[in-house]
Interface confidence: medium
C-alpha cells in the first residue's frame, strides 16, 4: 500500500509531479453544523482520465473504517457515491481537479477524530496514494437553542404544545405552564441526532407555557401563549 512518501512513478523529459496530498492539520466545527474536510493532491500521471476511486476513512490511515467512497468511470467527471456513512458525507471537491474535499453534515461530538483521504487510479496507471497524517476534526459542544415552539390542535378540541431544541450534548427539555402550583414537569423527548422534541399533550388552561432546554453548556427558553375565545354566557 502507499506509504505516504513522495513517489515519482513515471519518467518524463520534463520532471513529473510527485504524489503528494495536502490536508490542513485541523478543522473545527460546532455540533449540529456542517464541516468541510479539505484534501487536494498532485500525481505523476499526466492527464490521467481513467477510472478512479476517492476514499475517506476515519481513525487511522490505510486500515481505519471507510466513511465515504465514490468511483468515477473512465473519462467521467461524475464520482458516483458507493458509501456515505449515515448519509452524512458528501464529496465537495472534484477528483478530476485533484480535489477530494469532503463535506460532513449534522456533526456530533462522536465525529471528532482523524480523517484520511485516499485516491486510487485503477486504469492503465495503476496507482494509489493516501494521506498519512490526515486532518483532525474537532467537534465542539453546543449550548441549547430552541428551534421551534408551537401550539397545535389536539384530540377532543384540546390543544397540545411542541418544543424542539438542539444542542450537544442533547438538552433536557421541560415544560412549565399556568397549571395549579405552576409545577414544571420534565418530559421524555423524542431525539434525532442533536435535536430533541418534547410534547405537552394537553393544554388545559389559557396562559403562558414555557419550554426550557438545558445541557452542561447552558440553557434556553421560549414561550407560547394560549388564549381561547370564550363565547358570551
Amino acid at each position: 500500500d502507499a506509504s505516504g512518501d513522495l513517489l515519482n512513478t513515471e519518467a518524463h523529459s520534463a520532471p513529473a509531479q510527485r504524489w503528494s496530498m495536502q490536508v490542513p492539520a485541523e478543522v473545527n466545527a460546532e455540533a449540529g453544523d456542517a464541516a468541510v474536510l479539505p484534501c487536494t493532491f498532485t500525481h505523476p500521471h499526466r492527464h490521467y482520465d481513467g477510472p478512479l476511486t476517492a476514499i475517506w476513512r476515519s481513525g487511522e490511515p490505510y486500515a481505519g473504517p471507510q466513511v465515504f467512497r465514490c468511483t468515477a468511470a473512465p473519462g467521467s467527471e461524475l464520482c458516483q457515491t458507493a458509501l456515505s456513512l449515515h448519509g452524512r458525507f458528501r464529496l465537495l471537491g472534484n477528483p478530476r481537479r485533484n480535489d477530494l474535499s469532503l463535506r460532513v453534515e449534522r456533526l456530533a461530538l462522536a465525529d471528532s477524530g482523524r480523517y484520511f483521504c485516499r485516491v486510487e487510479f485503477t486504469g492503465d496507471a495503476h496507482d494509489r496514494y493516501e494521506s498519512r497524517h490526515g486532518v483532525r476534526l474537532r467537534v465542539t459542544a453546543a449550548a441549547p437553542r430552541i428551534v421551534n415552539i408551537s401550539v397545535l390542535p389536539g384530540p377532543a378540541h384540546a390543544f397540545r404544545a411542541l418544543c424542539t431544541a438542539e444542542g450537544e450534548p442533547p438538552p433536557a427539555l421541560a415544560w412549565s405552564g399556568p397549571a395549579p402550583g405552576n409545577s414544571s414537569a420534565a418530559l421524555q423527548g423524542q431525539g434525532h441526532g442533536y435535536q430533541v422534541t418534547a410534547e405537552l399533550p394537553a393544554l388545559t388552561r389559557d396562559g403562558r407555557y414555557t419550554c426550557t432546554a438545558a445541557n452542561s453548556l447552558g440553557r434556553a427558553e421560549a414561550s407560547v401563549y394560549l388564549f381561547r375565545f370564550h363565547g358570551a354566557p
Epitope: S20, Q22, P24, V27, V36, P38, T40, T42, H47, D49, A73, G75, S76, E77, L78, L92, G93, N94, R96, R97, N98, D99, S101
Partner: antibody
Framework: QVQLVESGGGLVQPGGSLRLSCAAS????????MHWVRQAPGKGLEWVSY????????YYADSVKGRFTISRDNSKNTLYLQMNSLRAEDTAVYYC?????????WGQGTLVTVSS | DIELTQPPSVSVAPGQTARISCSGD??????VHWYQQKPGQAPVLVIY???NRPSGIPERFSGSNSGNTATLTISGTQAEDEADYYC???????????FGGGTKLTVLG
C-alpha cells in the same frame, strides 16, 4: 452571508502589470477552491484561473498561462490575481467566484482596461 | 478543449416554457452548471450539477443533461427571467473550465 469583493482594477498600458484582490467573508475561505472569471465588454464569460483551498494546485486558461498568477492568503481571507504583460484583449470585468457545484458565489467584479 | 454551443437568443411569451440548449462532446460524463446574468450585474448560479437548484432559486428553473446536450428549462417564464444565460462545465483533460457563448432570453410582451 457570503460576500466577495474585488478591487485593484483600473487603466494600465499594454505590457504593464496589475494585481487584483478579492476579499472574502461569510464563509470558511480556507476550505474552498476559488476562481477568477472575466467578461470583456459586450462579450460572454471566460474562465481565467483556479486555485485549490490551500493554494497547492493552480490551473490557468491557455490565454493567460505564463502571464497571470493566482494566489491566496488564507490568513487574510483574500484571493489574488497578479497580471503581467497585459494586452488589449485582457480588457474585461474580472470576477472572483467561489468554486463549489459550479461557481456558487460571485463578486460584483472590477474593471481592468488595457489601453495606451 | 471542449466547446459548448448555445443559441444566441431564445424568445418566450410570459407564462410559457423556455428551453435553452447547450451542446458539447461527451456532456453526460461532465457536470453542467447554468448561470443567469442581468445587465450590469454579476452572474448568479441557477442550476448546478446538471439538475440541482441552489437555495433561493425558484422551482420553475430546472436542468437536464443527456446525449450531447444539456438543457435549462424555465417553466412559467416571468418577465424578471429576461437575462443572459450561460452553461459551464469542467474539461478534465485541459484542467480548465469552459463557458458556453451565452443565450439572451427575451420575454415577449
Amino acid at each position: 452571508q457570503v460576500q466577495l469583493v474585488e478591487s485593484g482594477g483600473g487603466l494600465v498600458q499594454p505590457g504593464g502589470s496589475l494585481r487584483l484582490s478579492c476579499a472574502a467573508s461569510g464563509f470558511t475561505f480556507s476550505s474552498y477552491a476559488m476562481h477568477w472569471v472575466r467578461q470583456a465588454p459586450g462579450k460572454g464569460l471566460e474562465w481565467v484561473s483556479y486555485i485549490s483551498y490551500s493554494g497547492s494546485n493552480t490551473y490557468y486558461a491557455d490565454s493567460v498561462k505564463g502571464r497571470f498568477t493566482i494566489s491566496r492568503d488564507n490568513s487574510k481571507n483574500t484571493l489574488y490575481l497578479q497580471m503581467n504583460s497585459l494586452r488589449a484583449e485582457d480588457t474585461a470585468v474580472y470576477y472572483c467566484a467561489r468554486g463549489w457545484g459550479g461557481f456558487d458565489y460571485w463578486g460584483q467584479g472590477t474593471l481592468v482596461t488595457v489601453s495606451s | 478543449d471542449i466547446e459548448l454551443t448555445q443559441p444566441p437568443s431564445v424568445s418566450v411569451a410570459p407564462g410559457q416554457t423556455a428551453r435553452i440548449s447547450c451542446s458539447g462532446d461527451n456532456l453526460p460524463n461532465r457536470y453542467v452548471h447554468w448561470y443567469q446574468q442581468k445587465p450590469g450585474q454579476a452572474p448568479v448560479l441557477v442550476i448546478y450539477d446538471d439538475n440541482n437548484r441552489p437555495s433561493g432559486i425558484p422551482e420553475r428553473f430546472s436542468g437536464s443533461n443527456s446525449g450531447n446536450t444539456a438543457t435549462l428549462t424555465i417553466s412559467g417564464t416571468q418577465a424578471e427571467d429576461e437575462a443572459d444565460y450561460y452553461c459551464q462545465t469542467y474539461d478534465m483533460f485541459s484542467m480548465s473550465d469552459v463557458f458556453g457563448g451565452g443565450t439572451k432570453l427575451t420575454v415577449l410582451g
